[in-house]
């Protein structure tokens, strides 16, 4: 009796399973009772990842520099090419088919995690006690002066975007 | 016992044609494909003609292409070889064989076909 | 179609040689290949499948390996039944095609 179903890594194609072709091969022709499968290597600067009966390799993935893209890892001829961001900017979606610059992080907010090339900048706000006065992409929130240490006294409370401001004590007379 | 047994064989002129049989015994023989393999006179092997195990598919050598045909009758137990336009170059012993998982794992013992004016 | 070449085309040796034969396919071909023996005036015979996979019955002095373009057949001890002539067949690509074949002859 012909089969219904095919073993893992076979296919049925007129009553008989043929192997498919293996990770980074092509289909060619399909088995018959007396040959098998024949397939054939991608050609550079293709890639098939799976086990497979296609006539056509993928072609592995461009990196556009005018997109702010580069390599991160060569493609190999079973598996893709995988893209990342120049410096400074990072991927718009998983697939990282288009690159962003860096969010920065307004005054009052600091760098909770410094963007790399696949996420961005994540800031958070500058908690009482911390203060942010300026817009950056790598700053963190700094704490307020201690006035204390430098034995003065507050004369202006800080803010999450300011300073305390600091001076000498009153003498007593 | 698996059996194949050709028959059909003999002297015959160039341009004519033979009818080769190959009776098969001892298995399903519905569930296997066969082929023709044939050895010219001092010569090495050569894969002529296959057929599946319904008749649905057929393959051929591109030398004999065109002019010999494979067939099977399941009821009867036999292959055959139509050989059409024969020529000096067909001279063989042709034997029969089964196929098991793309390789022939019964032979017939050969019938002899010689081709001559 | 693909091409099988073996060699050596003939071969002597003596009775408790190690013998080696080898098939080169003029395309890659995987381990698409089988063995046969044949004696002269009889049918082949399989001895070997899938480029290394012994036909049952076939005794354990023979074996193959190879895949790709390169394969061989070794008879580890020859015995006087193993004087014939081998062939190589590959299926790895329409049609199946054979080697010319390599001739064992008594030393």
């Known amino acids: 009796e012909p089969p219904t179903a095919c073993r893992e890594k076979q296919y049925l194609i007129n009553s008989q399973c043929c192997s498919l072709c293996q990770p980074g091969q092509k289909l060619v022709s399909d088995c018959t009772e007396f040959t098998e499968t024949e397939c054939l290597p991608c050609d550079s600067g293709e890639f098939s990842a799976q086990w497979n009966r296609e006539i056509r390799c993928h072609q592995h993935k461009y990196c556009d520099p005018n997109l702010g893209l580069r390599v991160q890892q060569k493609g190999t001829s079973e598996t893709d090419t995988i893209c990342t961001c120049e410096e400074g900017w990072h991927c718009t979606s998983e697939a990282c088919e288009s690159c962003v610059l860096h969010r920065s992080c307004s005054p009052g907010f600091g760098v909770k995690q410094i963007a790399t090339g696949v996420s961005d900048t994540i800031c958070e706000p500058c908690p009482v006690g911390f203060f942010s006065n300026v817009s950056s992409a790598f700053e963190k929130c700094h704490p307020w002066t201690s006035c204390e240490t430098k034995d003065l006294v507050v004369q202006q409370a800080g803010t999450n975007k300011t300073d305390v401001v600091c001076g000498p004590q009153d003498r007593l007379r | 016992e698996v059996q194949l047994l050709e028959s059909g064989g003999g002297l015959v002129q160039p341009g004519g044609s033979l009818r080769l049989s190959c009776a098969a015994s001892g298995f399903t023989f519905s569930s296997y494909a066969m082929s023709w393999v044939r050895q010219a006179p001092g010569k090495g092997l050569e894969w002529v003609s296959g057929?599946?195990?319904?008749?649905?598919?057929?393959s051929y050598a591109d030398s004999v292409k065109g002019r010999f045909t494979i067939s099977r009758d399941n009821s009867k137990n036999t292959l055959y070889l139509q050989m059409n336009s024969l020529r000096a170059e067909d001279t063989a012993v042709y034997y029969c064989?089964?196929?098991?998982?793309?390789?022939?794992?019964?032979w017939g013992q050969g019938t002899l076909v010689t081709v001559s004016s | 179609d693909i091409q099988m070449t073996q060699s050596p085309s003939s071969l002597s040796a003596s009775v408790g040689d190690h013998v080696t034969i080898t098939c080169r396919a003029s395309q890659s071909i995987s381990s698409y290949l089988n063995w046969y023996q044949q004696k002269p005036g009889k049918a082949p015979k399989l001895l070997i499948y899938a480029a290394s996979s012994l036909q049952s019955g076939v005794p354990s002095r023979f074996s193959g390996s190879g895949s790709g373009t390169d394969f061989t057949l070794t008879i580890s001890s020859l015995q006087p039944e193993d004087f014939a002539t081998y062939y190589c067949?590959?299926?790895?690509?329409?049609?199946?095609?054979f080697g010319q074949g390599t001739k064992l002859e008594i030393k």
């Open positions: 057929i599946g195990g319904s008749s649905s598919y057929t």
């Open positions: 067949q590959q299926y790895g690509s329409a049609p199946p095609t």
């Open positions: 064989a089964r196929y098991y998982s793309y390789h022939m794992d019964y």
